[in-house]
């Protein structure tokens, strides 16, 4: 058992038919020693009395919030919740599993830049009795500090096989940060999920340089060309890129659209704010970012019509 | 000193070879998106020694202004690292890598790059030298992994150090 | 007060089902767990398992696994236990009791409903 | 599973007079062991929990001791109405078990 934050308990169990449930004494803060009652949120009735109250914790109908009195008056309270750990792995019910490779994951980080600022996003079926807290720094040994905002639902649902998701957001800044050093410790976000009485949590370790995802390119323009099909398409770095941009380069794909989406053209990749294109009605132009150096995420496209 | 006394650095031949570094080394491995290679006890031997680029080793923009020397000398003390790496029994050994494939490669422009920085009998002090490799082949392959990451990041900020130069500091 | 009203007596035939109910009043329902035991006629009493109202978790002893359904209708705050493929050797007493929350016994019993299997 | 194992399987005491029943675990329970009596043709009744928790409303003639594998039930003074079947229960390990029972009978 070990303390979340003042008053609330976590409560590690095995979560096998076999294993033994957990003793758990609770102390009644206070300097009284006399006359002192417990109760449980689950029930009025008198569930002890003294100073102490030893309790077997074994299923959620055993978690939640124990209260100690003295003639009618709460002298303290104290919260249970359980970590389930089934077959040697702590459960991971509470969030989705995002499958986009051969790891679990649950959180998904992104950052638009190297300012050290980043967002991390996660997706859950539940919609009441959720709390979430985050965590972050900068190594485990010897944080270094990461400051992260409130938790926010987002408005976006997110459909996945079938099932409507709930999307949650938060943005994190180190405190530190040095955009043009080579990161040597990754950064660590822990999400705790509290569901009820169920606690989990959930980790993601990363550096910045992996999660880079440029915004798209903005300003995009297309100028005919005389006498030619072809058109020069120019667009301008994000701003919310890094500067100076001779420093933090980015490299540009092109792609023609043909309409419905259809017959996508050959990319034709550049380090310039331009280039030469076959523009043809009800086509489309699309460009897309990333990192000059380092291959992190490609942006989204930004798009615009030939005609 | 980098390069002779008296002459500017090389900015945009170090331009070239740096994003062909960059190529290279995204080549000899790929982007593999979420992989987190585990991170072991004595991990520490080859890869957490590496000579970084940090924060005072006045490789950002205002930095390079004021003296690049500082910045270069940090980028040869690591070229020198990942050029023996890569010529150590770590990557020579089995499993077999092809003489001319990316890592090959990769190996003959880190010297290039290197040579650039440190014409001959210009000498910098260079400060790690690689610890031995492990024995065992599932090993070796592992360290590559980890090495080739770990390049993949100190390239990625040469890179923009020499880019930075030729656009901002070349004569 | 406390209470646990269990339905009437049943007789049934070998190889039949049969579903006792346990209506629980004077707490909280949904908050404490519930659980049955079997008192064969002159013998101890055997755990068949509990369940949670709140959210139908059920933890089954394996000598009832497969033979026994445990329900709960949270509207009538009321718990049920279906016992299949009936045979003389269930013929007995079954008790449902509250589970002590922060303990694992039973604090307060129903007052039983006996099970008659004959042909 | 575990075994628990009750001795003795019945005793016969004389009013006013102590009496005390073992409960034996075949393997370590902590302390998560209650005792229940049963009256003839009536539901069980809890009377101490933890192992030597007293369970409201029961006179405290009642008392319990013991853990790991080793329990005992103490009546201080036997009563007329204390005659009945004593079930020691384990609850430590799924399934829950119960002691074979004590017959207590009040000369």
């Known amino acids: 058992i070990w303390e979340l934050e003042k008053d609330v308990y976590v409560v590690e169990l095995d979560w096998h038919p076999d294993a033994p449930g957990e003793m758990v004494v609770l102390t009644c803060h206070t300097p009284e020693e006399d006359d002192i009652t417990w109760t449980s949120a689950q029930s009025s009735e008198v569930l002890g009395s003294g100073k102490t109250l030893t309790i077997q914790v074994k299923e959620f109908g055993d978690a939640g919030q124990y209260t100690c009195h003295k003639g009618g008056k709460v002298l303290s309270r104290s919260l249970l919740l359980i970590h389930k750990k089934e077959d040697g792995i702590w459960s991971t019910d509470i969030l989705k599993e995002q499958k986009e490779s051969k790891n679990k994951i649950f959180l998904k980080c992104e950052a638009k830049n190297y300012s050290g600022r980043f967002t991390c996003w996660w997706l859950t079926a539940i919609s009441t009795d959720l709390k979430f807290s985050v965590k972050s720094s900068r190594g485990f040994s010897d944080p270094q500090g990461v400051t992260c905002g409130a938790v926010t639902l987002s408005a976006e649902r997110v459909r996945v096989d079938n099932r409507d998701y709930k999307k949650y957001t938060v943005e994190c800044q180190e405190g530190s940060a040095c955009p043009s050093a080579e990161e040597s410790l990754p950064i660590e976000v822990v999400v705790d999920a509290i569901h009820k009485l169920k606690y989990e949590n959930y980790t993601s370790s990363f550096f910045i340089r992996d999660i880079i995802k440029p915004d798209p390119p903005t300003n995009l323009q297309l100028k005919p060309l005389k006498n030619s099909r072809h058109v020069e398409v120019s667009w301008e770095y994000p701003d919310t890129w890094s500067t100076p941009h001779s420093y933090f380069s980015l490299t540009f794909c092109i792609q023609a659209q043909g309409k419905n989406n259809r017959e996508k053209k050959d990319r034709l990749c550049v380090d310039k704010t331009s280039a030469k294109v076959v523009c043809h009605k009800d086509a489309k132009i699309r460009v897309q970012a990333r990192d000059r150096y380092y291959s992190s995420s490609w942006s989204d496209w930004a798009s615009v019509s030939c005609s | 000193r980098a390069v002779p006394e008296g002459s500017s650095p090389a900015w945009i031949q170090g331009q070239q070879l740096s994003q062909k570094l960059c190529t290279l080394v995204w080549s000899a491995h790929p982007p593999m998106g979420h992989v987190d290679l585990p991170r072991e006890e004595g991990d520490g031997e080859t890869t957490s020694d590496v000579p970084r680029i940090q924060c005072g080793d006045g490789c950002d923009p205002q930095g390079l202004k004021d003296n690049s020397q500082f910045c270069l000398q940090r980028i040869h003390q690591g070229l020198v690292f990942y050029e023996k790496l890569l010529g150590s029994d770590i990557f020579t050994g089995e499993p077999s890598l092809l003489p001319d494939g990316p890592v090959g490669q990769l190996h003959a422009n880190l010297l290039g790059l290197r040579q650039l920085l440190q014409p001959e009998g210009h000498h910098w002090e260079t400060e790690q030298t690689p610890s031995p490799s492990p024995s065992q082949p599932w090993q070796r392959l592992l360290l590559r992994l980890k090495i080739l990451r770990s390049l993949q990041a100190f390239v990625a900020v040469a890179a923009r150090v020499f880019a930075h130069g030729a656009a901002t500091l070349s004569p | 007060e406390v209470q646990l009203v269990q339905s009437g007596a049943e007789v049934k035939k070998p190889g039949a089902s049969v579903k006792v109910s346990c209506k629980g009043s004077?707490?909280?329902?949904?908050?404490?767990?519930l659980g049955w035991v079997r008192q064969a006629p002159g013998a101890g009493l055997d755990w068949m398992g509990i369940m949670s109202p709140v959210d139908s978790d059920i933890r089954y002893s394996p000598s009832f696994q497969g033979q026994v359904t445990m329900s709960v209708d949270t509207s009538t705050s009321t718990a049920y236990m279906e016992l299949s493929s009936l045979r003389a050797g269930d013929i007995a007493v079954y008790y449902c009791?509250?589970?002590?929350?922060?303990?694992?016994?039973?604090?307060?019993w129903g007052q039983g409903t006996l099970v008659t299997v004959s042909s | 599973d575990i075994v628990m194992t009750q001795t003795p399987l019945s005793l016969s005491v004389s009013p006013g007079e102590p009496a005390s029943i073992s409960c034996r675990a075949s393997q370590g329970i902590s302390s998560w062991l209650a005792w229940y009596q049963q009256k003839a043709e009536k539901a069980p009744k809890s009377l101490i929990y933890?192992?030597?928790s007293l369970q409201s409303g029961v006179p405290d003639r009642f008392s319990g001791s013991g853990s790991g594998t080793d329990f005992t039930l103490r009546i201080g003074r036997v009563e007329a109405e204390d005659a009945g079947i004593y079930y020691c229960q384990q609850y430590n390990i799924y399934p829950y078990t119960f002691g074979q029972g004590t017959r207590l009978e009040v000369r």
């Open positions: 933890a192992a030597s």
């Open positions: 004077g707490y909280s329902f949904t908050t404490y767990w």
């Open positions: 009791a509250r589970r002590r929350p922060g303990q694992g016994y039973f604090d307060f």
